[in-house]
Interface confidence: low
């Protein structure tokens, strides 16, 4: 997170830290005791699928305070439409091997109904993004969980206000832009997969997933987030379905 | 909201509770009556939550500890009586006044619903948690705000 602040301990209780072979991989969002939402691109280069760990209740990576809960990731489900190395359909649903215990420091974020997300949450201007990613483009990652308030843009406004770059990916209907184009604040590498959380009348909801951008906090560019509202039925159907064998599963979308 | 308090034993009230901070027991001594003490204490200990006139559209306000209740006129509903129960009450208009989810119905009024772990309150629009850790709430802030003493 570039230009954010420390999320005080316990105030981002749905934030997940994903580790592979003990190393920081990505962020994620707890949506109930056994399921985590993250970004598909986080898993592009994974070889040791059995060494994926999700940590809940984490705050400061440099210390263990007893509120952390670690779980093996039993399954990673990615939409069949996602192509590794690209940006569209950048979503993954992770099943934990064992459920986490909900505590003051471990709480799920609400996965909203689609219509509510599309016609109400999408028009809440500011939302919070969080993670332990880089504090500057090509800079060091954070030890304490960082959080940033970002404004959401309509896609046409995002395109009009963004500097044109020859090989820039399209902003599809499965994404949205949020943040600042003045180079001051953005999510960054290492925050991928983490939550874009929107507050409405006293409750927080998952509206986006940290996905991609032209560098981080680059002048003339906004952060791009996976538009979670497009995947609600897909996520709900998968969470209701019987477990399948294998760690990586490509599930048909829509 | 509490004009009668000003008349009641003004000398001792000024001395005990306004010039200095008084306890519930000291207030009880002044008022000699549990119900009146409670009314005074709610306003005194954390401010009159009705002072900002939160109830809209002619609704009346009752002060509570760190909160308030609005009693709405028949044509209005919602925490602050802000929602009209009329033809405009559809989900595309301000989420139909619902705190969480809203469903439109042909020929009848829209209905509000709540996420798993919440249930709909009697006002028909608000949701209250039914589990210890409902989604989308931050326990350390919820607890802090619920127990936080108000400064004066």
């Amino acid at each position: 997170i570039v230009g954010g602040k420390v999320c005080p301990k316990g105030e981002c209780p749905w934030q997940v830290l994903l580790l592979v072979n003990g190393a920081q991989l990505c962020g994620g969002t707890l949506i109930n005791t056994i399921w985590v939402v993250s970004a598909a691109h986080c898993f592009d280069k994974i070889k040791n699928w059995r060494n994926l760990i999700a940590v809940l209740g984490e705050h400061d990576l440099s210390e263990h305070d007893g509120d952390e809960q670690s779980r093996r990731v039993a399954q990673v489900i990615i939409p069949s439409t996602y192509v590794p190395g690209t940006t569209n359909h950048d979503i993954a649903l992770l099943r934990l091997h064992q459920p986490v215990v909900l505590t003051d420091h471990v709480v799920p974020l609400c996965l909203p109904e689609r219509t509510f997300s599309e016609r109400t949450l999408a028009f809440v201007r500011f939302s919070l993004v969080s993670g332990w990613g880089q504090l500057l483009d090509r800079g060091a990652t954070a030890l304490e969980l960082m959080v940033l308030n970002v404004p959401r843009l309509m896609t046409q406004d995002c395109l009009q206000q963004s500097r044109k770059v020859g090989d820039s990916p399209n902003i599809t209907e499965y994404m949205f832009c949020a943040g600042y184009s003045d180079g001051s604040k953005d999510s960054c590498k290492g925050d991928s997969g983490g939550p874009h959380a929107t507050h409405y009348r006293g409750t927080w909801y998952l509206t986006g997933i940290v996905s991609w951008g032209q560098g981080c906090a680059t002048v003339g560019h906004f952060g791009v987030y996976t538009r979670v509202s497009q995947y609600i039925e897909w996520l709900q159907k998968l969470m209701r379905s019987e477990p399948r064998p294998g760690v990586l599963l490509r599930a048909p979308f829509p | 909201a509490n004009a009668f308090l000003e008349e009641l034993r003004p000398g001792s009230l000024e001395r005990e509770c306004k010039e200095e901070q008084c306890s519930f027991e000291e207030a009880r001594e002044i008022f000699k009556d549990a119900e009146r003490t409670k009314l005074f204490w709610i306003s005194y200990s954390d401010g009159d939550q009705c002072a900002s006139s939160p109830c809209q559209n002619g609704g009346s306000c009752k002060d509570q500890l760190q909160s308030y209740i609005c009693f709405c006129l028949p044509a209005f509903e919602g925490r602050n009586c802000e929602t009209h129960k009329d033809d405009q009450l559809i989900c595309v208009n301000e989420n139909g006044g619902c705190e969480q989810y809203c469903s439109d119905h042909t020929g009848t009024k829209r209905s509000c619903r709540c996420h798993e772990g919440y249930s709909l309150l009697a006002d028909g629009v608000s949701c209250t948690p039914t589990v210890e850790y409902p989604c989308g709430k931050i326990p350390i802030l919820e607890k802090r705000n619920a127990s936080k003493p108000q400064g004066r």
Epitope: K5, V6 | I138, I140, K148, G151
Partner: antibody, heavy 122, light 107 residues
Amino acid sequence: QVQLQESGPGLVKPSQTLSLTCTVSGYSISSDSAWSWIRQPPGKGLEWIGYIYYSGSTNYNPSLKSRVTISVDTSKNQFSLKLSSVTAADTAVYYCARSVNYYGNSFAVGYWGQGTSVTVSS
Amino acid sequence: EIVLTQSPATLSLSPGERATLSCRASQGISDYLHWYQQKPGEAPRLLIKYTSQPATGIPARFSGSGSGTDFTLTISSLEPEDFGVYYCQNGHSFPLTFGAGTKLELK
């Protein structure tokens, strides 16, 4: 009732370190809130120096960051300010303060100490 | 950093009159703006938080409005104890910043 009381020397020599302590009564410093230092040069406006959050994390004003350290001693229910390499420009009334930081940003300062005057002079 | 510009610098009014104090932010800060009152020799006192929410114990004659970059503090009918310096504060972005103040003096 929350009360904050600043203490420390009223006179500091240039280039030395200014050290102030804020003692909090009526409230546990480790239970919540951001505990801040704010200063006011004579006849001027208010300047936020920095805060220490109840969890121990700090945030400082970039204009002073290289010279400021704010720490907490939960056993004494105190938090402290150290400002190094002081000059006459650091002469001010220094306030310690508490703000309840709800989710996102807020930092409305609801509780203040009465302030302590510090003069930097040789 | 966010710069807050308060106007007027000095406002001379009599008890019973209405006072309108302005605070302008150099960039949008939503409703994260707070108002304080300071009297000589005293610490500031929080009056209004989040643009329009009165702090505990603040008389109803004090009210706040605005959003984004333009904010107003209104005192509907001045009492003798209302004279002093009023500061607005940005609570949106670090560093937290204050306006230079508006001195409300007795005419």
